[in-house]
């Protein structure tokens, strides 16, 4: 009588998460009488996966009709595979007894689960940085298997090379995670720029997953300030303009100082956007020259995005303007002529 053989023809089987896995097993003889059981893993800690003899295994079904004695086929199908099902499965023949006696095991079939990576999540720096500075972006994706994965970074469609990528864990696991950090040098033109993290994996059939981050969340473009005086008006009032240009984000506070004293404070809001994503703002102040004996030092003070204030000063030469008899002594006309002009230039 030939020795009983337990045949597991496939050394390995790869299945996509959510699909069913078929694990094949045949025996060369039905003698002696006794059950076939399926285990994951070997040794004392092995996990019972299916026992024809007893138990409730809702995800496992025999491939062949177990009531047909002569088929010798003890293959099983496991439904709704998840990465947690990965491992080596053994088909084991027992001889009936109390307890059942293990006679022979198959060579084992390694089940690997192809699981898609999660959508990459890209996160940028916690604080904004200005042009010429380097900021780091991190991309994370989880739950994929097998371990082999490709990650690329792009900025406005151009591939980046300054990045470091890690796949964890380093050893064998049911699923893996990837984390990559890219270093990006900012320019003043990056308000509308985007970084893209692209993940390619065997489960994605050539259609990579992408995660994006807008550099607008990471960049601060400080404003240019220019204070100019318009020509004298007939009513002895001088129009002084403070042009604040090319700044981002919009969060900006402007304060006019006359000879060091706060004259007016304004907050930027609802500004039109320049083509490059930055903003411009113009504020102007009317100064009644005839009310001053000495030159007036006007300062436009801009506080942008919580940064230290930037000042630009301008002196209005009172001596250059003849005084009007009986003029108002106020340093500033506080009537309706005193106003801001909000303007945007490209």
């Amino acid at each position: 009588e030939e020795e009983l053989q337990v045949i597991q023809p496939e050394k390995s089987v790869s299945v996509a998460a959510g699909d069913s896995a078929t694990l094949n097993c045949t025996v060369s003889s039905l003698i002696p009488v006794g059950p076939i059981q399926w285990f994951r893993g070997a040794g004392p800690g092995r996990e019972l996966i299916y026992n024809l003899k007893e138990g409730h295994f809702p995800r496992v079904t025999p491939v062949s009709d177990p009531t047909k004695r002569n088929n010798m086929d003890f293959s099983i199908r496991i439904s709704n595979i998840t990465p947690a099902d990965a491992g080596t499965y053994y088909c084991v023949k027992f001889r009936k007894g109390s307890p059942d006696v293990e006679l022979k095991s198959g060579a084992g079939t390694e089940l690997s689960v192809r699981a898609k990576p999660s959508a990459p999540v890209v996160s940028g720096p916690a604080v904004r940085a200005t042009a010429e500075h380097t900021v780091s972006f991190t991309c994370e994706s989880h739950g994929f298997s097998p371990r082999d994965i490709t990650l690329k970074w792009f900025k406005n469609g151009n591939e980046l090379s300054d990045f470091q990528t890690n796949v964890d864990p380093a050893g064998k696991s049911v699923s893996y995670s990837i984390r990559s950090t890219a270093r990006v040098v900012l320019t003043r033109r990056d308000v509308h720029s985007q970084v893209i993290c692209e993940v390619a994996h065997v489960t994605l059939q050539g259609d990579p997953l992408r995660g994006t981050a807008n550099l607008s969340e990471a960049i601060r473009v400080p404003p240019f300030l220019e204070v100019t005086q318009q020509s004298m008006r007939a009513d002895n009032q001088v129009n002084v303009t403070c042009q604040v240009t090319k700044f981002y984000p919009q969060r900006l506070q402007l304060t006019w100082l006359e000879n060091g004293n706060v004259s007016r404070t304004e907050m930027a809001s609802a500004l039109p956007e320049n083509k490059d994503g930055t903003y411009n703002w113009t504020s102007w102040l009317l100064v009644n020259v005839s009310a001053h004996r000495d030159d007036v030092k006007l300062t436009c003070q801009v506080e942008h995005d919580g940064q230290p204030a930037v000042n630009k000063s301008f002196s209005v030469k009172v001596s250059a303007h003849p005084k009007e008899q009986g003029s108002n002594t106020a340093a500033e006309n506080t009537g309706t002529n005193e106003r801001n002009i909000y303007g945007g230039s490209g």
Partner: antibody, heavy 118, light 107 residues
Framework: EVQLVESGGGLVQPGGSLRLSCAAS????????MHWVRQATGKGLEWVSA???????YYTGSVKGRFTISRENAKNSLYLQMNSLRAGDTAVYYC????????????WGQGTMVTVSS | DIQMTQSPSSLSASVGDRVTITCRAS??????LAWFQQKPGKAPKSLIY???SLHSGVPSKFSGSGSGTDFTLTISSLQPEDFATYYC?????????FGQGTKLEIK
Amino acid sequence: EVQLVESGGGLVQPGGSLRLSCAASGFTLSSYDMHWVRQATGKGLEWVSAIGTAGDTYYTGSVKGRFTISRENAKNSLYLQMNSLRAGDTAVYYCVRGGVWDDAFDIWGQGTMVTVSS
Amino acid sequence: DIQMTQSPSSLSASVGDRVTITCRASQDINNYLAWFQQKPGKAPKSLIYTASSLHSGVPSKFSGSGSGTDFTLTISSLQPEDFATYYCQQYVSYPYTFGQGTKLEIK
């Protein structure tokens, strides 16, 4: 339909012989362990004999050396040759199929009556 | 030989009752225990194998449990067709042996 039909029972004198047959249909008899079980009138069930798929045979102590179980694959039939019959062998004899992998009884024949009496 | 002891030997119950029959083996038989139902003048019918698995076509009102030496058969809600004699059997090793039977009668 899976079915077992026994025949060959009857009245026999003590010391006599009888050959019971069991015709199987709906399955291949040689692929299963097959059994004979008997039941004396008003009594419980008693396992008598078995034949495995490899032709290995088993008997209860009281019939060893007197009864022989066999099968004929070509006829898909099981037999029980009963010699040196005794009054205590009087019973209904059932042919039973053993289950797929553990030999749990699943299919029973309707039985045939054997009476040993002078 | 392994001895199988059933209790009670007989049992009176009413339609709708839940009844339990026990079977004890003289030694550990793992879960290689079967239950059979037999009506007068008929061949036994297989109900349960490996202590708790129902044969095909057997209604779920029948259930079995146990392992080792102590086993039970439970009928959840008796119907008129359930009044019969019930036998347990060990089939872990030859000679296979049966319990003496439990006769379930209508009250």
